[in-house]
């Protein structure tokens, strides 16, 4: 089955789709471009804002991070919270507002687009959504704790990025989450520009690797704001 294959490291660079190409013709992406899959729930609208449920920081806007709303609260209930400004306490980079990062538990100023760190860990992941039904199938992504003694390889089912080996992050893949490669220079990345501006992509991209940040591709600067392609670029 799919899940047994996902737990192996056997399948990596698969051929392009019918009539496709490994990279996009006319766009500067590498052979495994990291162009990935659909997904979602019903989300709040910007004009009717409600707490936005999340499972990881990448599901929130750039000025937010994903956490339990109450200290020591149920880790299974997480929402997007406003990012923390300079000199505020933090536990990870994603908690700090853009232009800052977490150092020794405090948000400090960084050089522009400091590496944001992991697509952060969450204790639980909600796989279902308003439109989804498992039609009697068990949730095959429920994992025993035994599986976490070794770090997951590419394609292994995971719950959080810390379950994955170095160079991989835990990202959504249809109804489950798997370890996917962190994006390399030139690969297309996702830059969520504002609160509520994106849904939960079922096929989720990892973040850019260390020393890289997700920026507008240089040859796209002339395009309109909404049509700019983002790629992982050196700081």
């Amino acid at each position: 089955t799919l899940n047994s294959v996902l737990n192996s490291n056997a399948i990596k660079n698969l051929p392009p789709p019918l009539g496709g190409a490994a990279g996009h013709p006319g766009s500067a992406v590498s052979a495994a471009p990291g162009i990935l899959y659909p997904g979602g729930n019903k989300y709040q609208t910007i004009d009717n804002y409600q707490p936005y449920p999340c499972a990881e920081d990448e599901e929130c806007g750039t000025d937010e991070y994903c956490a339990s709303p109450t200290r020591g609260g149920d880790a299974g209930v997480q929402i997007c919270l406003a990012c923390r400004k300079r000199r505020k306490r933090c536990m990870r980079h994603a908690m700090c507002c853009p232009g800052n990062y977490c150092k020794n538990g405090i948000c400090v100023s960084s050089d522009q687009n400091h590496f944001r760190g992991e697509i952060e860990e969450t204790i639980t992941e909600s796989f279902g959504n308003d439109h989804s039904t498992l039609d009697g199938y068990s949730r095959r992504t429920t994992l025993s704790s035994k599986m976490y003694h070794t770090k997951g390889q590419e394609g292994s089912v995971c719950l959080r990025s810390s379950d994955c080996a170095s160079g991989l992050c835990c990202a959504r893949h249809f109804w489950s989450k798997i370890c996917k490669p962190v994006l390399k220079e030139g690969q297309v990345c996702t830059k969520h520009r504002r609160k509520g501006s994106h849904g939960l992509e079922i096929f989720q991209r990892c973040y850019c690797g260390e020393g890289l940040s997700c920026r507008i591709q240089k040859d796209h600067h002339q395009a309109s704001n909404s049509s700019r392609l983002h790629t992982c670029q050196r700081h």
Epitope: T1, I35, L36, Y37, P38, G39, G40, I178, T190, G199
Partner: antibody
Framework: QVQLMQSGAEVKKPGASVKVSCKAS????????ISWVRQAPGQGLEWMGW????????NYAQKLQGRVTMTTDTSTSTAYMELRSLRSDDTAVYYC?????????????????WGQGTTVTVSS | DIQMTQSPSSLSASVGDRVTITCRAS??????LGWFQQKPGKAPKRLIY???SLQSGVPSRFSGSGSGTEFTLTISSLQPEDFATYYC?????????FGQGTKLEFK
């Protein structure tokens, strides 16, 4: 070559159910998802839902939730879409389309190959 | 849910014309968009995937561009067989959604 062959036209009465089949050939059926799309006469395309041919996981359009069931039979490489409690506004051409390479976690390009369509007429 | 707004809804053109169809997403969809051509009584046929990549076997006069929320399909020099209805489709977030369609007719 990759092909999706759908079952023939159906005429149904309001309140009845219809089950449309979509037989895949030319590729490994369980390595992809299948989407179902419908088109009412003179109207645009409407996405109905998606199913993983590997394990039957589904994702349905909210407006059809409770009336639609998508299934697969891996032994015959066939996908099925059943729609219950039919109404006159369910009269449409129903298409299946191959959608998503399940084992590919580098990219996703959506629906590529489509079936020829099945006309379902709901009339009393 | 993501709404796809396609314009124009209909378009009259002549053979040899350059034609542009636009699709706007209600929220960012990266480049998770395809363009399809449909002729009467036939199933849709994919022309463009990943917003800008040409499907194998599709003539090079068809091209796609855009990412995020604004996308365009361009036919550089219209041929008689290109008169059809064109749809965009976003597959970034469920439920997947199509544009309303653009009917391309003879002027």
């Amino acid at each position: 070559q990759v092909q999706l062959m759908q079952s023939g036209a159906e005429v149904k009465k309001p309140g009845a159910s219809v089950k449309v089949s979509c037989k895949a050939s030319g590729y490994t059926f369980t390595s992809y998802g299948i989407s179902w799309v419908r088109q009412a006469p003179g109207q645009g395309l409407e996405w109905m839902g998606w199913i993983s041919a590997d394990n039957g996981h589904t994702n349905y359009a909210q407006k059809l939730q409770g009336r639609v069931t998508m299934t697969t039979d891996t032994s015959t490489s066939t996908a099925y879409m059943e729609l219950r409690s039919l109404r006159s506004d369910d009269t449409a051409v129903y298409y299946c389309a191959r959608d998503g390479e399940l084992l590919n976690y580098y990219y996703y390009y959506g629906m590529d190959v489509w079936g020829q369509g099945t006309t379902v007429t709901v009339s009393s | 849910d993501i709404q796809m707004t396609q314009s124009p809804s209909s378009l009259s053109a002549s053979v040899g014309d350059r034609v542009t169809i636009t699709c706007r997403a209600s929220q960012g969809i990266r480049d998770d968009l395809g363009w399809f051509q449909q002729k009467p009584g036939k199933a849709p046929k994919r022309l463009i995937y990943a917003a800008s990549s040409l499907q194998s076997g599709v003539p090079s006069r068809f091209s796609g561009s855009g990412s995020g929320t604004e996308f365009t399909l361009t036919i550089s020099s219209l041929q008689p067989e290109d008169f059809a209805t064109y749809y965009c489709l976003q597959h970034n977030s469920y439920p997947c959604s199509f544009g309303q369609g653009t009917k391309l007719e003879f002027k």
